[in-house]
């Protein structure tokens, strides 16, 4: 025979073809072998011109031989070489599908691989590719879009060889709150790490606000609106600064009275105050908390105390906010001026969390009277808020 070629090569099959011998022959003897693969020999009829090779090993170079037989006579042997394809990974599956994450798992191919190419594409045409190592059989997809159809494909790699792609289709779950109006809604969307988040006042995407969310204290979901921790930020600021907010949300900061008014106008909120000093901790929770608008000079409502710090905020309930340049307190003197801070002063304070950091002079420092009195400036303080019905929302989400 002559003109031995292989066609239709896959990872486990190939088709051998040849030109028949000019003379009539009884049979053809076909043999094929590969590295680490024992030789297989087959005899076929003399009028056959092709033979399907099956049960081949993937990604293997085979040597194929064929000769003709007529009675006791044998023709010369002709030879061809071919390499089987790399077989594909198997059983690609998307599990643990959330609004922005999913876990892809697969079974490895039979052939050894040098890695895998993962491609995932959303219906809007956004394509991402990632190459993972040869021992990997799962990959966590992140930063997906909620409520979106995705096609995920995987291909095995072995040097220059690439397997066929296999694919799976999945749909991310919709966010409970596409435009979370506070940290509790961000948490109910599945975000459980404390840090910076964007919230949308009244769920309006045009009213974006970057906030620090405390996702750990007492179940999480808190918007932190004040933090004192090291004295690097100046809190002896004017009315305009306290209305707008100032500082670094990751460090010491004040979120702003206008923002507090807008947030607490969204529903019923609770206040939590966390205090820390030389290894001691205390907290206060008030189940009703709101801040009025600029017309009321950001009047404070705080009721329903529980906790370990003592009820020092009650003294300030119903008071307007005061700064050194806008004196709204009930004292003849200017409390903000006298105590170098700003607060919902009365005459003057039980709480002075915006006082002078580290100042242990009477009433000048970061004070919470019923915990450390007025002659001890507290090292760490945070004020934070979340919806009063957060526990109910959280329970509903868990049941869902």
């Amino acid at each position: 025979p002559s003109g031995l070629v292989t066609a239709n090569i896959t990872d486990s099959e190939a088709l051998a073809r040849w030109q028949p011998a000019i003379a009539t022959v009884d049979s053809y003897v076909i043999s094929y072998t590969g590295e680490k693969v024992p030789e297989i020999t087959r005899t076929v009829s003399g009028n056959t011109v092709e033979y399907a090779l099956t049960d081949l090993e993937p990604a293997t170079e085979y040597t194929l031989r064929i000769f003709a037989e007529k009675g006791p006579q044998k023709s010369s042997t002709i030879t061809a070489k071919f390499t089987t394809d790399l077989d594909s990974p198997r059983d690609l599956t998307a599990t643990e599908v959330q609004s922005e994450t999913a876990l892809l798992t697969w079974r490895p191919p039979r052939a050894s691989v040098t890695g895998y190419l993962l491609v995932y594409e959303s219906v809007d045409g956004t394509v991402k590719e990632v190459i993972v190592g040869p021992d990997t059989t799962s990959y966590s997809l992140a930063d997906l879009s909620p409520s979106t159809h995705y096609t995920a494909k995987i291909q095995a790699l072995n040097g220059p060889l690439r397997s066929n792609m296999i694919q799976t289709i999945f749909t991310t779950i919709g966010l409970l709150y596409p435009f979370p109006k506070d940290c509790s809604q961000a948490m109910l969307n599945g975000d459980t790490t404390s840090g910076l988040y964007t919230i949308y006042l009244n769920g309006d995407k045009a009213e974006a606000l970057e906030v620090f969310c405390d996702m750990t204290s007492d179940g999480g979901g808190w918007i932190v609106f004040l933090r004192r921790k090291n004295g690097r930020e100046n809190f002896y600021q004017n009315w305009k600064a306290y209305a707008a907010g100032f500082g670094d949300r990751r460090e010491e900061f004040w979120l702003g009275l206008d923002n507090l008014n807008k947030i607490t106008a969204q529903g019923q909120y609770e206040l939590r105050v966390d205090l820390r000093d030389h290894g001691e901790t205390a907290f206060a929770v008030y189940d009703k908390f709101s801040v009025g608008d600029a017309k009321t000079r950001y009047k404070l409502k705080v009721e329903g105390y529980s906790g370990t710090a003592g009820d020092s905020m009650a003294y300030h309930n119903g008071r307007s906010f005061s700064t050194f340049d806008k004196d709204t307190d009930s004292a003849i003197t200017n409390c903000a001026l006298s105590y170098k801070g700003a607060f919902w002063y009365r005459n003057c304070h039980r709480v002075n969390l915006m006082g002078r950091y580290g100042d242990n002079n009477h009433s000048q420092g970061v004070n919470w009277f019923h915990w450390k009195g007025h002659e001890h400036s507290i090292q760490f303080a945070e004020m934070k808020l979340r919806p009063s019905n957060f526990r109910n929302l959280e329970g509903r989400r868990k049941r869902a």
Epitope: Y305, A314, Y315, S330, I332, N347, S363
Partner: antibody, heavy 120, light 107 residues
Amino acid sequence: QVQLVESGGGLVQPGRSLRLSCAASGFTFDDYAMHWVRQAPGKGLEWVSGISGSGGSTYYADSVKGRFTISRDNAKNSLYLQMNSLRAEDTALYYCAKDISAVMDVPQTWGQGTMVTVSS
Amino acid sequence: DIQMTQSPASLPTPVGDRVTITCRASQYIQGFLNWYQQKPGKAPKLLIYDASNLETGVPSRFSGSGSGTDFTLTISSLQPEDFATYYCQQSYSTPQTFGQGTKVDIK
């Protein structure tokens, strides 16, 4: 309008007990802290004890600590002062007073008082 | 405990005169100071709280001032119905304490 009516005073021997009551009306009782203040005959005012609106926090003057107990029943709009181990120096007119807020702050509105006389 | 010292103990004053009563706290109390008026056989009545805030219904001739440790109650023009005993009281910390009283009587 706010009304506070004290009762339970009387003549009692030293070492004995007495329970004073204060019936409140005209305001949401559990929204306000309450106080007991006394005045010995011909003398000045002495703050005795106080209790927060919820009843969760109680406070006492050193002179009565360990002998007197303040309590309240918000369902009955009533304030109480249980006085044990009474002494002659506890003889006074006892006033109940409503605070301006839910915590120890300013005794704002006072009742007319009930007289306690400790004598053998 | 915080001691409250009032002066004078007695203040004979003619009707129409200005009256000034002072009160000193034994320690710093910000503005946590209140003034009461007591007439014979009657319960005390709150006049001023937070050192300077006039209680509802109290005539404007009464005023309070001061901060920290030193406080003053002023009656700008003494009226016949103002003859009474006046007490200062600190509400800064418990136990709350009263001054010993100042008796304003007719001169």
